[in-house]
């Protein structure tokens, strides 16, 4: 039902849902610190623009008694319970920053009259695509899917001369929230990825994956999985791998590959790693100390959510426009704003755009090297290393189907 918003007369409030069930197991204190750091910046920016207004955040905690699994499985009801709490207290802000779980975001969007914007650090699933008042500040599954299709079709690079049309997808059900939805999107029979591929099989057992590595009758040389190098090692170990196998390891929120002293272990030589362009360093931040790379990105998304709200508030106030209107609720898209770590671009549907980076292991240096980058905003691939020192024959990626000649 409609809830009056604390969002007028020079006082603007942000409702931050602090949910026990979260896309990443991040202490809520760290997220609070991120929000507070963002608020300080927003206040400074508004003051600098000559706008003498108050901006605050209200942190809404769930009781944690019922919804305490800690992951996203019981998040659907937790999100709705928090909304009910807001409704009962008549304490809705101008914007809702919160649910990171796809389940909760989808249900909250469905079950409320959303006349206010919703900003999420997460909500990776396809079911949260194309939502008119939802903004997502971490790369959603749709963006990954578009990269993969683009890369599969590419056949005019010195190191990739074959179009691919097949793939195995390894998905065993123990994935993190981001990986779960990324792989879910690839698995879905109605998704763009499935539509564009001629053959795709999901491997659900460790043994299935392990058998494919040397199976002469395999239907594809390409296997997509999601996680870090350790996850791959647990699964693959030091098993022999056929020379034309290519493993695509999706590990978007991990910038450790770019650290100077990192050496790629031997088991990564058949692997291309897909990650995000580094830079989320948060070097001087009070909230970023002791955070893992993934959690840095999560906390950064909360901080950037605050900065995004400040950006939109500033624009609307400067134009003398009302904040509690559908126009404001629908405005958080198709724009670039100054984020904490640099410019942040949102697409027409309010989803963050980014530069994805595909890395390979150099057989010469045992270092991760950039093979190509992909700009999600323009859906375009940019080759970086035109003569990579691959493990694959002739320093070229193999065909996706063994024995099939040039196409």
């Amino acid at each position: 039902s409609q809830v009056s918003q604390n969002c007028h007369n020079g006082s603007y409030e942000i409702s931050v849902l602090m949910m026990g069930n979260s896309a990443f197991a991040e202490p809520l204190k760290n997220l609070e610190d991120a929000v507070n750091e963002g608020l300080e910046i927003v206040r400074g920016r508004l003051q600098n623009a000559g706008l003498n207004v108050t901006v605050n955040a209200t942190f809404m905690y769930s009781d944690g008694l019922i919804h305490n699994s800690g992951d996203c499985r019981s998040s659907t009801c937790e999100g709705l319970d928090l909304l009910r709490k807001i409704s009962n207290a008549q304490r809705m802000g101008c914007v809702l920053i919160g649910p990171s779980c796809t389940y909760s975001t989808f249900q909250m969007y469905l079950d409320t009259e959303l006349s206010y914007p919703m900003i999420s650090a997460g909500s990776f699933g396809l079911s949260c695509d194309y939502k008119e008042t939802l903004t997502r500040l971490m790369s959603p599954a749709r963006k990954l899917m578009y990269f993969l299709v683009n890369f599969w079709k590419t056949n005019d690079l010195p190191f990739k001369t074959y179009s691919w049309s097949t793939s195995y997808v390894y998905k065993n059900g123990t994935e993190t929230e981001d990986c779960f939805w990324y792989l879910n999107a690839l698995e879905a029979s109605v998704s763009y990825f499935s539509h564009e591929l001629g053959f795709k099989v999901v491997l659900r057992q460790d043994k299935e994956f392990q058998d494919i590595l040397m199976d002469h009758n395999r239907k594809s040389n390409v296997i997509i999985m999601c996680g870090g190098p350790e996850f791959l090692y647990k699964l693959k170990g030091d098993r022999a791998v056929a020379e034309d196998i290519v493993i695509i390891l999706v590990d978007l929120f991990n910038d450790q590959y770019f650290e100077d002293n990192v050496t790629a272990p031997d088991y990564m030589k058949n692997v291309l790693v897909l990650t995000l362009s580094p830079g989320n360093s948060l070097l001087n931040s009070s909230f970023s100390r002791n955070l893992s790379p993934t959690k840095r990105d999560f906390a950064l998304a909360y901080l950037n959510g605050i900065l995004l709200f400040g950006h939109m508030l500033k624009i609307f106030l400067e134009n003398g426009e009302n904040i509690t209107t559908p126009k404001f609720a629908h405005a958080f898209r198709n724009l670039t704003f100054e984020g904490y770590d640099g410019p942040v671009t949102l697409d027409d549907w309010g989803d963050v755009d980014s530069t994805m980076v595909l890395l390979y292991t150099s057989v010469d240096t045992k270092k991760y090297k950039v093979l190509l980058t992909y700009d999600t905003h323009v859906n375009k691939t940019y080759p970086v290393d035109m003569s990579p020192t691959f493990t694959w024959k002739n320093s070229k990626l193999p065909n996706d189907i063994t024995g099939r000649g040039p196409q």
């Epitope: 910046i41 400074g44 360093s281 948060l282 070097l283 100054e338 770590d341």
Partner: nanobody
């Protein structure tokens, strides 16, 4: 009104070093990123280095490995340490801070400081 003041320019021999400073009376460096630009005679103004709120830095290819941008929030100052200077680094150096405008530059400029690299 935000004012930016550059200092530290001068004449230096090739291979030498200089440290430029950009100071503001406001808290602009705490709320926005900041860029150093330069403009050589008869040439377009070009970006040299950027420092974002997070402390992340980026550099143009021409100065990568030689120049370092840094910030001291307590002093409301951003620095550009320039090492191994070359004659082609000769230019007027400007600091640019604040919100990015439609033209992709930030809204506030300093008056510039001249750097001349010559033997």
């Amino acid at each position: 009104e935000v004012q930016l003041v550059e200092s530290g320019g001068g004449l230096v021999q090739p291979g030498g070093s200089l440290r430029l400073s950009c100071t503001s009376s406001s808290n602009i460096f705490k709320i926005y990123g900041m860029d150093w630009y330069r403009q050589a005679p008869g040439k377009q103004r070009e970006i040299v280095a950027t420092i974002y709120l997070s402390g992340r830095t980026t550099y143009s290819d021409a100065v990568k490995g030689r120049f370092t941008i840094s910030r001291d929030n307590a002093k409301n100052t951003v620095y550009l340490q320039m090492n191994t200077l070359k004659p082609e680094d000769t230019a007027v150096y400007y600091c640019n801070a604040g919100e990015t405008t439609a033209s992709s530059v930030r809204q506030y400029w300093g008056q510039g400081t001249q750097v001349t690299v010559s033997s």
